[in-house]
Interface confidence: low
């Protein structure tokens, strides 16, 4: 899988990251998971291994398979909801994943990041760093 | 065959937690979903949440986020529901499905004081 | 939430009438529709899955069709073991919504 290394939102906006995989990993689950550890992260969201989107709570996932591209959407970001997150597919045998670093800057803080030009609180991510983890 | 086996009725006082547990047998436990539906007395069905045995992800529908939930342990393919600060609304047969293609036999939690 | 709708609520019907009962999403749901019959004091049992597929094992007298936003579940020849309350369901969007059901009473 790619996707970014570390992504910055601000405080109450959103954020999207989008993480790529390979062929043939069209229809495994996909899934958006929170923590240090990667066996032992909790998983927020996860797809059907359709292209169907699924939301829970503030977070969202999609899946594009004909792109081999799932985005997922973190809305009215809190300050702890910087953390590590995970990227991750599953399969049979070890899940595929990337690290993703999530930075929330607080409210009213300057933030580095290029906004979306429709909404100045939502910031996307396609990964201008990326790193494989396969 | 495949076969989806709940734990018993419970009574419980409102503000408890009741945990039910649902046993399966007869497929590969972590190759499918397993929800978790619930019927109030003469009502439809509702939907809770899924968990997926393999990854241990779980979806809950929001009304019930942050009071439910559902667990698994691969070695005896048991997965569990945990509905907390219980209230007399929550009196309802509660289901496992698996996927919802198989149904376990129910469950009935009665919450009174 | 995706809201399901279903009509009638209830319907008496003799043995050997065609029963048709339509469900009705809020929203495009495409074909992700899920048709489900019950009796007193069972669980649910699948029937059509993906708006017109036929579970394994189900009789071939239930047929369902529809996308989008319409739905129907039709049984072409009523047995007396099909009196029961059926519902729809949709599995599009979490959360995933049953319809109110349709009880299918004896004449």
């Known amino acids: 899988i790619q996707g970014p290394e570390s992504v910055r939102a601000p405080e109450q906006g959103s954020l999207t990251v989008q993480c790529h995989y390979k062929q043939g990993w069209e229809t495994y689950i996909k899934w958006w998971c929170r923590g240090v550890r990667w066996d032992t992260c909790k998983i927020l969201i996860e797809t059907r291994g359709s292209e169907q989107g699924e939301k829970s709570d503030r977070v969202s996932i999609k899946d594009n398979q004909k792109d081999r591209t799932f985005t997922v959407t973190m809305e009215g970001l809190r300050r702890d909801d910087a953390d590590v997150y995970w990227c991750g597919i599953e399969r049979r045998g070890p899940d595929l994943g990337t690290q993703v670093k999530v930075i929330v800057d607080p409210e009213g803080a300057a933030s580095t990041t290029a906004s979306s030009p429709t909404n100045s609180n939502m910031a996307v991510f396609i990964g201008s760093h990326k790193r494989n983890h396969y | 065959q495949v076969q989806l086996v709940q734990s018993g009725a419970e009574v419980k006082k409102p503000g408890a937690s009741v945990k039910v547990s649902c046993k399966a047998s007869?497929?590969?436990?972590?190759?499918?979903?397993m929800h978790w539906v619930r019927q109030a007395p003469g009502q439809g069905l509702e939907w809770m949440g899924w968990?997926?045995?393999?990854?241990?992800?779980?979806i809950y529908a929001q009304k019930f986020q942050g009071r439910v939930t559902m667990t698994r342990d691969t070695s005896t393919s048991t997965v569990y529901m945990e509905l907390s600060s219980l209230r007399s609304e929550d009196t309802a047969v509660y289901y496992c499905?698996?996927?919802?293609?198989?149904w376990g036999q129910g469950t009935l939690v009665t919450v009174s004081s | 939430d995706i809201q399901m709708t279903q009509s009638p609520s209830s319907l008496s019907a003799s043995v050997g009438d065609r029963v048709t009962i339509t469900c009705q999403a809020s929203?495009?749901?495409?074909?992700?529709l899920n048709w489900y019959q019950q009796k007193p004091g069972k669980a649910p049992k699948l029937l059509i899955y993906?708006?017109?597929s036929l579970q394994s094992g189900v009789p071939s007298r239930f047929s369902g069709s529809g996308s989008g936003t319409d739905f129907t579940l039709t049984i072409s020849s009523l047995q007396p073991e099909d009196f029961a309350t059926y519902y729809c369901?949709?599995?599009?969007?979490?959360?995933?919504?049953f319809g109110p059901g349709t009880k299918v009473e004896i004449k």
């Open positions: 993906g708006a017109s």
């Open positions: 968990i997926n045995p393999n990854s241990g992800g779980t």
């Open positions: 007869g497929y590969t436990f972590t190759n499918y979903r």
């Open positions: 929203q495009d749901i495409s074909n992700y």
């Open positions: 369901q949709q599995s599009y969007s979490t959360p995933w919504t």
């Open positions: 499905a698996r996927d919802l293609d198989y």
